[in-house]
């Protein structure tokens, strides 16, 4: 997290807003709930109380306007800029402007009035950008999806660094961002895409360029917003510049940033038995055209040329890959070798040879 | 209905530089991903660069830190910025939105020369 320049902050912990103007994009009363609904995300993590007032002069003054409004700071028009706040002080200290050439919305289409509206109110209490991609605070917008929103843990610091806790957090379950290098980190899936290696971890992945050292760190939701959160397993099949990404009995195919119509389509339609209910790791090989699906503690193997399941099969991990054990969290096969991650470990396993070669930690992927 | 022209065209010496645009008709363009692929003589058509409605990009592999894809939503066009050239860069280069099931350009061609 990151706070202002000379930490400005409210002296007090009593705060007034008012809703000066409306969009036209949704109801009064959806904007009312929308903008409530931000400040409870602060309020309940902090000793700060929010009152709404109906005229007059409030701390935050909420509006929208369309380019320039009256700020010297100009909007720009549809996307680009969709709202900015002044950090705490007398005046425009505290006030939050939003993008009236933006569709503001309850849902994920447009742009997400809720929140914006609690990134915007972060910033009216002091909160500057975060570095984290996985914060409210990072400055790329992107929707996380209908559950229930819960405040991650790197804002939570931030404000608590301002204003101290409250007391009594009625959502005390605050989202990580995953650390790389933790010696515990276990992989959820690892594909390869356009010649680059994603790393899938709760809601993120990191993106390892070939040529590079330090992993990115994004939201999945930021690269493909209609798939879940987090995915089980995922490969790519190179020649056909798609990606399938598993998520329990669902799956999808993608081409870059786009999903293919008709997904997702149910993970039986591949020929797997209906009391599977998710595929924990999945790798294929452009070589043969096969791709292996493990899921407990069987493996099948699935023919892409033909779209039909192998005969044979499922079979045991410990038969036909001794010593890995009976699970696979994550899988990727590169140069001859396959690389199974069970745990925080990953086991590094000859094709031709048939066997483990090496044994490492899970995060060795990352260069930990 | 989106339609996609490319413009750009040209002949480069090798470690020069090129832009093409893709001027977009269609007010869904800012809702759909904008990507540009390439297809060399007697090859298949291949990933170039890509950028999400969000403006995340990726790269192949061959020209990350050579190209830069960018776009602007307002105007309804697409860019790319093709420098340090390679021989191996010459091909007819597509405009894409919305992926291999979207939009396609009719193709520009750009010849590197050594």
């Known amino acids: 997290y990151n706070v202002f320049p000379r930490t400005l902050k409210w002296s007090k912990m009593n705060l007034t807003y008012r809703i000066v103007n409306y969009t036209p994009d949704m109801t009064h009363s959806e904007v009312e709930k929308a903008f409530k609904k931000a400040f409870k995300v602060w309020s309940d993590v902090t000793p700060l109380n929010f009152t709404r007032l109906h005229d007059g002069i409030a701390d935050i003054m909420i509006s929208f306007g369309i380019k320039e409004h009256g700020d010297f700071y100009p909007f720009d028009g549809p996307s680009g800029l969709l709202a900015h706040a002044f950090p705490p002080g007398p005046n425009y200290g505290g006030d939050a402007h939003f993008d009236d050439d933006e569709t503001w919305t309850s849902s994920s289409k447009g742009y997400n009035l809720f929140l914006v509206a609690a990134h915007e109110f972060g910033h009216s209490l002091g909160l500057d950008h975060s570095k984290d991609p996985g914060a409210l605070m990072f400055p790329i917008y992107t929707y996380t999806g209908k559950s229930h929103f819960m405040l991650p843990d790197d804002d939570v610091q931030g404000i608590q660094s301002l204003y101290g806790p409250g007391d009594e957090d009625p959502n005390p379950k605050h989202p990580k961002t995953p650390d790389k290098c933790d010696p515990s980190l276990s992989l959820d899936a690892i594909t390869s895409l356009r010649g680059e290696t994603m790393i899938f971890k709760d809601r993120f992945f990191w993106r390892l360029h070939p040529q590079q050292v330090d992993a990115e760190l994004f939201l999945t939701k930021s690269f493909w917003p209609e798939l879940p959160n987090r995915i089980d397993a995922a490969y790519e099949h190179p020649s056909h510049d798609l990606i399938f990404i598993f998520r329990g009995r669902k799956f999808w195919a993608l081409n870059g940033y786009d999903i293919l119509e008709g997904y997702p389509k149910k993970i039986s339609e591949l020929g797997l038995p209906k009391e599977v209910k998710k595929i924990s790791a999945a790798v294929h090989f452009e070589d043969t055209g096969k791709t292996l699906l493990f899921s407990g503690n069987q493996v099948w193997r699935y023919d892409d040329t033909n779209h039909i399941m192998d005969k044979d099969y499922p079979r045991l991990i410990e038969e036909d890959f001794p010593g890995i054990g009976d699970k696979v969290d994550a899988v990727y096969e590169k140069n001859g070798y396959i690389y199974f991650f069970n745990g925080p470990i990953q086991f590094e396993y000859s094709i031709w040879s048939n066997r483990i070669v090496r044994v490492m930690p899970a995060n060795s992927i990352l260069w930990c | 209905e989106v339609q996609l022209v490319e413009s750009g065209r040209g002949s480069v010496q090798a470690g020069g530089s090129l832009r093409l645009s893709c001027a977009a008709s269609?007010?869904?363009?800012?809702?759909?991903?904008m990507n540009w692929y390439r297809q060399a003589p007697g090859k298949q058509r291949e990933f170039v660069a890509g950028?999400?409605?969000?403006?995340?990009?990726n790269y192949a592999v061959s020209v990350k830190g050579r190209f830069t894809i960018s776009r602007d939503n307002a105007e309804g066009t697409g860019y790319l910025q093709m420098n340090s050239l390679k021989p191996e860069d010459t091909a007819v280069y597509y405009c894409?939105?919305?992926?291999?099931?979207?939009?396609w350009g009719l193709g520009t061609q750009v010849t590197v020369s050594s």
């Open positions: 894409n939105a919305g992926g291999l099931q979207g939009y």
């Open positions: 269609g007010s869904t363009f800012s809702r759909r991903s």
């Open positions: 950028i999400s409605t969000g403006r995340i990009t």
